[in-house]
Interface confidence: low
């Protein structure tokens, strides 16, 4: 939905948010294609692809924020994710190079869908914040206030380490979205229930 065309129906909005976060925690939509495209699919490499502790807010932290703080933190974190994804996309091979090397073009398309999907989620976050009458939550195009941002990655010594850093970041992102989904799943039937 475009900004300004927010649903006023809480359950519809919550359903959309839950559906979007369900999709975004699916590694086959982002992490797995990234691993294939970047040539990181050597045995057990996922063990080196674990997120760095503290890169994303934990589920425990998210649960303790209350609805307003949660949406604000989610919005800000996704803002950081958008910046990192833009950076990662610049380092990806181009479509014509993929075709020449026999790589699956669908993997690149999946990666390129990540940012539009996040923008859609941020729009619904904005709509939900409006519904909760939370004027503090930033619009989707801005980073929210009061949220800790995922740290800038350590400067990588070489191309492989940069790929690995991207891999760790995406692993953390999927884990974070899983936590987000669990928090949304605990939200009640009404915007007024358990409101802090």
């Amino acid at each position: 939905a475009a900004i300004g065309s927010c649903s006023k129906e809480y359950r519809v909005l919550l359903g959309q948010l839950q559906k979007q976060t369900d999709l975004m925690q699916d590694t086959s939509r982002l992490l797995d294609p990234y691993i294939r495209i970047q040539g990181l699919d050597v045995p057990k490499l996922r063990e080196h692809c674990r997120e760095r502790p503290g890169a994303f807010p934990s589920e425990e932290t998210l649960r303790g924020l209350g609805r307003r703080g949660f949406l604000q933190t989610l919005n800000a974190t996704l803002g950081c994710v958008l910046h990192r994804l833009a950076d990662l996309e610049q380092r990806l091979p181009k479509a014509q190079d993929l075709e020449r090397s026999g790589l699956n073009i669908e993997d690149l398309e999946k990666l390129q869908m990540a940012r539009p999907n996040i923008l859609g989620l941020r729009n619904n976050i904005y709509c939900m914040a409006q519904l909760l009458d939370n004027s503090d939550t930033a619009e989707p195009t801005k980073a929210g206030r009061g949220a800790s941002q995922p740290p800038t990655p350590t400067p990588a010594s070489d191309a492989f380490q940069r790929k690995l850093e991207g891999c760790r970041f995406l692993h953390g992102y999927h884990r974070f979205m899983h936590s987000v989904g669990r928090v949304f799943s605990k939200w009640g039937e009404s915007p007024n229930r358990s409101r802090r």
Epitope: G39, V42, K44, E47, P93, L98, S101, G102, L103, F160
Partner: antibody
Framework: EVQLVQSGAEVKKPGESLKISCKGS????????IGWVRQMPGKGLEWMGI????????RYSPSFQGQVTISADKSISTAYLQWSSLKASDTAMYYC???????????WGQGTLVTVSS | DIVMTQSPDSLAVSLGERATINCKSS????????????LAWYQQKPGQPPKLLIY???TRESGVPDRFSGSGSGTDFTLTISSLQAEDVAVYYC?????????FGQGTKVEIK
């Protein structure tokens, strides 16, 4: 600092058993593979096999399958290479090395010289 | 098994001159799924363990001087030392990790002329 420290040189007789060790430090021992590489006197490098200490998943080169056993004890960050019955042709320098799966080996132990002679 | 063949077996080069070592694999080590060449280069000095120089055919390991470079794709690869230094005297090995068992070339001995 990543380090792989191997046990000392061994002199054995044919038919004897032997277990040499490789202790890792300075990194998460259970998150990387440990490979073993043989170098016979004046010769090149031969890959023997690898183990993933996290779950003891082990892969052998067909040339060494059944000739040696690779194992690991993650509680003490140590990998092992053992023979149940040594032959004179086992005389060589044996290196352990850290790897990203069955791939390149980025850190190497100092080597253990095994001499088998009657 | 993939057979790795290096040439030449030995090489004598003057200090400051370029040294070139070739490595040929019996089948391609280029993964069509990710466009990476599964090839590494090692340096072994007398009495020392091997040291990783290059992986993914052309990525220099951290701390390796930039006079070392790797190139090539598919079945033909090259390690180049752009300006040979005294400390570069060693045996150099290529290694494929496209498939198990991992296999090494027989080695190329680099000496000073």
């Amino acid at each position: 600092e990543v380090q792989l420290v191997q046990s000392g040189a061994e002199v054995k007789k044919p038919g004897e058993s032997l277990k040499i060790s490789c202790k890792g430090s300075g990194y998460s021992f259970t998150s990387y593979w440990i490979g073993w590489v043989r170098q016979m006197p004046g010769k090149g490098l031969e890959w023997m096999g690898i183990i993933y200490p996290g779950d003891s998943d082990t892969r052998y080169s067909p040339s060494f399958q059944g000739q040696v056993t690779i194992s690991a004890d993650k509680s003490i960050s140590t990998a092992y290479l053992q023979w149940s019955s040594l032959k004179a042709s086992d005389t060589a320098m044996y290196y352990c090395a850290r790897g990203f799966g069955a791939s390149y080996l980025d850190y190497w132990g100092q080597g253990t010289l095994v001499t088998v002679s009657s | 098994d993939i057979v790795m063949t290096q040439s030449p077996d030995s090489l004598a080069v003057s200090l400051g001159e370029r040294a070139t070592i070739n490595c040929k694999s019996s089948q391609s080590v280029l993964a069509s799924s990710n466009n990476n060449n599964f090839l590494a280069w090692y340096q072994q000095k007398p009495g020392q363990p091997p040291k990783l120089l290059i992986y993914w055919a052309s990525t220099r390991e951290s701390g390796v001087p930039d006079r070392f470079s790797g190139s090539g794709s598919g079945t033909d690869f090259t390690l180049t030392i752009s300006s040979l230094q005294a400390e570069d005297v060693a045996v150099y090995y290529c290694q494929q990790y496209y498939s198990t068992p991992l296999t090494f070339g027989q080695g190329t001995k680099v000496e000073i002329k």
